[in-house]
């Protein structure tokens, strides 16, 4: 065999060494490329594991949580299941009271008599709030509602039926105040505010009576 | 106008019982309802019981089941029977239609106290 056989030979062996050297240095990159993906997508799955478990817990809070609101709201009920309704039919509740206006036209007198027969009074404003309901519950209607307010004569005070005399602070009764009448001066409301008038008068009124706020 | 007399107060002891009378000088047969009213000293007087003229009584909750109102229409007279009493049913005691009111008469004082 010649030298330069022997050389052609040798360069060839070179070239293949060089080209298995490559190739693997290439399995190589290729497998460390891989264990560092597989490495990212450890750690990613490591945090979606770890995300998870935390918004389980939070839903295993909020369930716990809902599961109390539910007790609450069942034990509510069955309190409420209990009670009776808080104003008969057709009455209208507000407050600590329940309302009902009439349906027709009488007296003042003949007005306390049917509020009296359904265990009731003619209408008394307590506060502004009342004020303010009976105001907005009448807004609707431009009729005269008699109310539980009433003197005798000019000389006498303003008395609800109880006997409790008008708060000076939360209307002004307006009208025929100085008249005499033989059956009494009473108070009506229209159109949101009081006037005085002969008790004998027709007119609408307002019966109230205190509401059942009281489990049975 | 109608005149009213009260009468039948008088110093009694817790759990004592009183009656109370109101004679009016004219008929209280035609009137809605007439009532007892009572005033404390430093109070507003409020309502303590009423009755109509078909026959229904109301009551103030403070009084329910101790005090019984009543009338006897041929006298014109309206009781009040007053049981089981009670320091702060001390108060002045009137008489007077409900609403309406005539003129009040004097009252008849109740003093509860041992």
């Known amino acids: 065999m010649q030298l330069s056989q022997v050389s052609d030979l040798l360069t060839q062996e070179q070239a293949n060494l060089t080209h298995q050297k490559k190739k693997l240095e290439g399995q190589i990159s290729a497998r460390q490329q891989a264990e560092e993906a597989s490495q990212e997508s450890e750690n990613e799955l490591k945090e979606m594991i770890e995300t998870l478990a935390r918004k389980l817990n939070e839903k295993s809070k909020e369930q716990m949580e809902l599961h109390h609101q539910n007790l609450n709201l069942q034990e509510t009920l069955k309190r409420v299941a209990n009670c009776s309704a808080p104003c008969p039919q057709d009455w209208i509740w507000h407050g600590e009271n329940c309302y009902l206006f009439s349906s027709g036209s009488f007296n003042w007198e003949k007005s306390q008599e049917k509020c009296l027969s359904l265990d009731a009074k003619l209408l008394k404003i307590n506060s502004t709030a009342d004020l303010d309901f009976i105001q907005q519950a009448i807004s609707y209607s431009s009729f005269p509602f008699w109310m539980g307010l009433s003197r005798r004569n000019p000389s006498y005070p303003w008395l609800w039926e109880d006997g409790s005399p008008l708060m000076p602070h939360l209307f002004r009764v307006r009208g025929a105040v100085s008249q005499t009448y033989p059956s009494g001066t009473c108070a009506y409301i229209q159109r949101g505010a009081v006037y005085a008038e002969n008790c004998i008068l027709a007119a609408f009124s307002i019966c109230q009576k205190k509401a059942n706020l009281r489990a049975q | 106008e109608v005149q009213l007399v009260e009468s039948g107060g008088g110093l009694v002891q817790p759990g004592g019982s009183l009656r109370l009378s109101c004679a009016a000088s004219?008929?209280?047969?035609?009137?809605?309802?007439m009532a007892w009213y009572r005033q404390a000293p430093g109070k507003q007087r409020e309502l303590v019981a009423h009755l109509t003229n078909s026959g229904r009584t109301g009551y103030a909750d403070s009084v329910k089941g101790r005090f019984t109102i009543s009338s006897d229409n041929a006298k014109n007279t309206v009781y009040l029977q007053m049981n089981s009493l009670k320091p702060e049913d001390t108060a002045v005691y009137y008489c007077?239609?409900?609403?309406?009111?005539?003129?009040w008469g004097q009252g008849t004082q109740v003093t509860v106290s041992s």
């Open positions: 007077n239609r409900l609403g309406l009111h005539w003129s």
């Open positions: 004219g008929s209280i047969f035609t009137i809605n309802a």
